[in-house]
């Protein structure tokens, strides 16, 4: 799978994580920080 950094317009897309662009899948993906979940790492869990 080809990946790259997200475009600058997606700054802030991932609330608590790193935004990755999955080129072949035509979509952005959030790699969440520890303790966060959700499509955009918006949910905190203990």
């Amino acid at each position: 799978v080809s990946i790259t950094k997200c475009n600058s317009d997606m700054n802030g897309y991932c609330l608590h994580g790193q935004c990755i662009y999955l080129v072949d899948m035509s979509q952005n993906y959030c790699r969440c920080e520890v303790g966060y979940t959700g499509v955009r790492c918006e949910h905190f869990y203990l």
């Epitope: 475009n7 600058s8 317009d9 802030g12 897309y13 609330l15 979509q27 952005n28 499509v39 955009r40």
Partner: antibody, heavy 116, light 106 residues
Framework: QDQLVQSGAEVKKPGASVKVSCKAS????????IQWVRQAPGQGLEWMGR????????RYREKFEGRVTITADTSTNTAYMELSSLRSEDTAVYYC?????????WGQGTLVTVSS | DIQMTQSPSSLSASVGDRVTITCKAS??????IAWYQQKPGQAPRLLIQ???TLQPGVPSRFSGSGSGTDYTFTISSLQPEDIATYYC????????FGGGTKVEIK
Amino acid sequence: QDQLVQSGAEVKKPGASVKVSCKASGFNIKDTYIQWVRQAPGQGLEWMGRIDPLRGNTRYREKFEGRVTITADTSTNTAYMELSSLRSEDTAVYYCVRSGTLFDFWGQGTLVTVSS
Amino acid sequence: DIQMTQSPSSLSASVGDRVTITCKASQDIHKYIAWYQQKPGQAPRLLIQYTSTLQPGVPSRFSGSGSGTDYTFTISSLQPEDIATYYCLQYDNLRTFGGGTKVEIK
């Protein structure tokens, strides 16, 4: 399956406002950005602006600043684009476009006609 | 705003010809360019994103290349069903469409 269903065609008088809705099904708009694009008859595509429904942040093309308002209601999974002070040059098909989780998934378009 | 200059605005070619369309950005867009095909009365159809990644179901005669500010879209062998208007779109920093290229059969 994922869908963006837009409101029906509108006819407006110059100076009036129009509000076009874009209802999402099959996905949560909070996971995406919703863009708005328009196309006047026989003309090219023109990006107007976008909203991040989760944060409520909006960005607009400079030429539309102050005249366009993009909003989202996450409880109904619907985005809206309101354009005010309409003039004949605003006659166009208006599209909502999902981006973020999937690259550029388009609604069917809404024709807005501005005529006296 | 980033400007996208697309050329030519129209072209006429024969079936089987190689067709090339270019888009020049006013600043580096880091390969974040997409290409759309639009036929009359239809919504635009995404052909290519991230410069060269073909969408599922799009024929391999369509291709894209480029980097920095200069990008190219190519139809290797023009077919009658390719008659349409083609648009580039930069999506690095907000979004800007090129002016479009109307492709006709000679």
